[in-house]
């Protein structure tokens, strides 16, 4: 669809005569008839196949025709066509004299014709005007013409319809050839697909408007390139959605079981050495001078009763000093100047001569100790209770009060709640500080794996076209991650099917 435009510029009829040579009375009141038709090697009368147009009286005898496109649109003359412009044409321009006001052909005498010109040739669509001048013996006509496309039509022959739009069926303007030119941020054959945020993951992200990055199920992050771990995953990561791969030192289905209490909590104080001894369990080995489950208590050097034979201990900055009773000497009052004759053994201890009576040794009754049986036995001084057990003196003996999860004379045995195989259907048992936890096989759940649930949603291979299947353990459903070029909940459909209609 387009318009053939003809701009009449000047008509010269100096003598004011008709084609017959007869003069016009009082002058030649001139109007024009234009016939546009298909190309003819020799332009002949017949239907004006491309259209006709007539002007009103434009002047008398000789005159210039003013550009009137802004007014009534009479000049240039418009010959619209609703077909593909063929690139060739024939044009007939007739100048007529109008004796009266009726310009219809049937109202004019045949000899009212002033002049007739006929041209033909090639004409490409374009904005540039072609200037032409046709001269006869008595008249001269100067004019220009061109072919332009109608609004929304483009291309070499005005055959391509294109209407700019900016809605959800396209975001584009039209190029001179009728092709679409997408607005910034849009792509696709019809510019209806937004260009997502730069770097947005091709499979795991998408967008509904430019520079956006919306994540598909199981993915997160600004560029949708971070997987979402299993719901409840505490100290773990994922490489594909809904995984929970435990960080070092953590275990269990949700990576919430602390296998490295020492590193994560540093419970041992005062430079003690920490040893992991099970889940949330540890043992501190204290440096000299410290005691307590976490070596948090500072020992006085006298607390170990280093002075023997009744010597009294005095703390000093650099250690301790023993004040020995009469008859004893040495760093720890360990040397005696006494013999059995001096009855040195207390609390019913028996004296035995040694080294030909130069010194002696006391044999102490139960519950007493020391070189002179002067000390009541404290069976807890050596911290015999393991795993943080509390030592209690009970008369002639001692006992260990164990922390939960431990047993044995010295709390050296870990109580296993798993010993009675409490997990049903092949579940794996894990000892916890205050009980146990069962990790259930696929298809079972519950505290003891006693509840039968649905099997792995991905087991039936529901995803097509080599898509990756992820099981969402929290909902027992699957998510298909489609390869490029496929869509659908199971990735079963290729993108962009060919057109089809219901007829």
């Amino acid at each position: 669809s387009g318009v053939f435009q003809l701009q009449l510029q000047e008509f010269i009829n100096e003598r004011g005569v008709l084609a017959s040579g007869r003069p016009c009375e009082p002058g030649c009141r001139t109007f024009f008839r234009v016939c546009l038709k298909h190309f003819q090697a020799v332009v002949s009368p017949g239907p004006c196949t491309f259209g006709t147009v007539s002007t009103p009286v434009l002047g008398t005898n000789s005159f210039a025709v003013r550009d009137d496109s802004s007014g009534g649109g009479r000049n240039p003359l418009q010959l619209p066509f609703n077909f593909t412009w063929p690139g060739t044409f024939s044009l007939i321009i007739e100048a007529w004299h109008a004796p009266g006001d009726d310009l219809r052909p049937e109202a004019l005498p045949p000899d009212a014709l002033i002049s007739k010109i006929a041209i033909q040739g090639s004409l490409a669509v374009g904005q540039n005007w072609l200037l032409d001048e046709q001269t006869s013996t008595l008249t001269r006509l100067r004019y220009s013409y061109r072919v332009i496309c109608s609004d929304n039509y483009y291309g070499d022959n005005c055959s391509r319809l294109c209407k700019k739009r900016n809605d959800h069926f396209g975001h584009y303007v039209c190029q001179p050839d009728g092709n679409l030119s997408c607005l910034p941020g849009w792509t696709g054959e019809y510019c209806q697909q937004p260009i997502c945020l730069s770097g947005c993951h091709e499979q795991n992200g998408y967008c509904s408007k430019p520079a956006e990055c919306l994540c598909r199920p199981g993915w997160q992050g600004r560029l949708c390139n971070e997987c979402i771990p299993h719901n409840g995953c505490r100290h773990g990561t994922c490489s594909t959605p809904w995984q929970c791969t435990c960080d070092e030192g953590w275990g269990g289905l949700f990576c919430d079981q602390d296998l490295n209490y020492c590193t994560h909590h540093s419970p041992c104080k005062n430079g003690a050495t920490c040893s992991n001894s099970g889940q949330r369990s540890y043992t501190c080995t204290c440096r000299p001078g410290y005691t307590g489950v976490d070596c948090e208590l500072e020992l006085s050097e006298c607390d170990s009763n280093p002075c023997r034979n009744g010597g009294s201990c005095k703390d000093q900055e650099d250690g301790y000093h023993c004040l020995c009773p009469p008859g004893y000497y040495g760093l720890h009052c360990e040397h005696s100047t006494l013999s059995c004759a001096d009855s040195p053994c207390f609390n019913g201890g028996s004296c035995r001569e040694r080294n030909q009576g130069a010194n002696y040794a006391c044999e102490c009754p139960p519950n007493f100790t020391g070189s002179n049986c002067e000390k009541k036995v404290d069976r807890c001084t050596s911290n015999p209770c393991a795993n943080g057990g509390q030592c209690l003196n009970r008369g002639p003996s001692r006992m260990c009060r164990c922390r939960p999860g431990f047993t044995g004379t010295y709390c050296e045995l870990h109580v296993s709640d798993c010993a009675r195989n409490p997990c049903a259907h092949g579940g794996t048992c894990h000892d916890l500080e205050n009980g146990l936890m069962c990790t259930c096989p696929a298809g079972f759940s519950g505290r003891r794996c006693e509840v039968r649930t649905s099997i792995d949603a991905c087991a039936s291979s529901p995803c097509f076209n080599r898509a990756t299947c992820y099981t969402d353990l929290s909902t027992d459903t699957f998510v298909c991650n489609c390869p490029y070029g496929f869509v659908g909940s199971r990735c079963e459909f290729p993108v962009g099917l060919p057109p089809s209609f219901p007829w």
Epitope: L161, R165, D167, Y190, E492, F493, P502
Partner: antibody, heavy 121, light 106 residues
Framework: EVQLQESGPGLVKPSETLSLTCTVS??????????WGWIRQSPGKGLEWIGD???????YYNPSLKSRVTISVDTSKNQFSLKLSSVTAEDTAVYYC?????????????WGQGTLVTVSS | SYELTQPPSVSVSPGQTASITCSGQ??????ASWYQQKPGQSPVLVIY???KRPSGIPERFSGSNSGDTATLTISGTQPMDEADYYC?????????FGYGTKVTVL
């Protein structure tokens, strides 16, 4: 061949929410070429476009109904749905779902058979 | 809001040409579609992109669109063409239908 089928209650009480579902068969709702629309026709009246949705979830609504309309899509079921809240007798109409084709410049080449929804107490 | 205006009714004798107009501001700058709806049936697309016919639609249906008016022309009208006809266009992101024209084949 593509087919669209509307489903939902035929009677809704005033002030309640009208809910309809359109099930698409014979083609994928996730095809980037199509938008999926809802159109209604009151008894003896003309067609009124309600809104449409793209498979990504992008929605477009008629401004005159926007405050009451919600359209959603479930690609796994190949369905899209319409919810119209606070209905009155004026909302009594035959509701159609249709496929709008980008290549047809937004023309709707496939329609459901329509379902009559009456708003009455 | 954008409006499309159609004549309520058009009458035509069998074999004659029926023309239905659809007017809207600068409608020629938008793509017009036309739908045929017979009583008790869903609408059927008969013209899209101003003048294109979907496959299965008879050649007697044609369309044009320029200025403020789109026109659906049924040449050689047949009794089976008696129906309501709706024009439709998109204004930004909103679908707009004309009020409809009832074509009666006398």
């Amino acid at each position: 061949e593509v087919q669209l089928q509307e489903s939902g209650p035929g009677l809704v009480k005033p002030s309640e929410t009208l809910s309809l579902t359109c099930t698409v068969s014979g083609g994928s709702i996730s095809n980037s070429r199509y938008h999926w629309g809802w159109i209604r026709q009151s008894p003896g009246k003309g067609l009124e476009w309600i809104g449409d949705i793209y498979y990504t979830g992008s929605t477009y609504y008629n401004p005159s109904l926007k405050s009451r309309v919600t359209i959603s899509v479930d690609t796994s079921k190949n369905q899209f749905s319409l919810k119209l809240s606070s209905v009155t007798a004026e909302d009594t109409a035959v509701y159609y779902c249709a496929r709008e084709d980008v290549i047809l410049r937004g023309g709707s080449d496939y329609w459901g058979q329509g379902t009559l929804v009456t708003v009455s107490s | 809001s954008y409006e499309l205006t159609q004549p309520p009714s058009v009458s035509v004798s069998p074999g004659q040409t029926a023309s239905i107009t659809c007017s809207g501001q600068r409608l020629g700058d938008k793509y017009a579609s036309w739908y045929q709806q017979k009583p008790g049936q869903s609408p059927v697309l008969v013209i899209y992109e101003d003048s294109k016919r979907p496959s299965g639609i008879p050649e007697r249906f044609s369309g044009s669109n320029s200025g403020d008016t789109a026109t659906l022309t049924i040449s050689g009208t047949q009794p089976m063409d008696e129906a309501d006809y709706y024009c439709q266009a998109w204004d930004r992101d909103t679908g707009v239908f004309g009020y409809g024209t009832k074509v009666t084949v006398l």
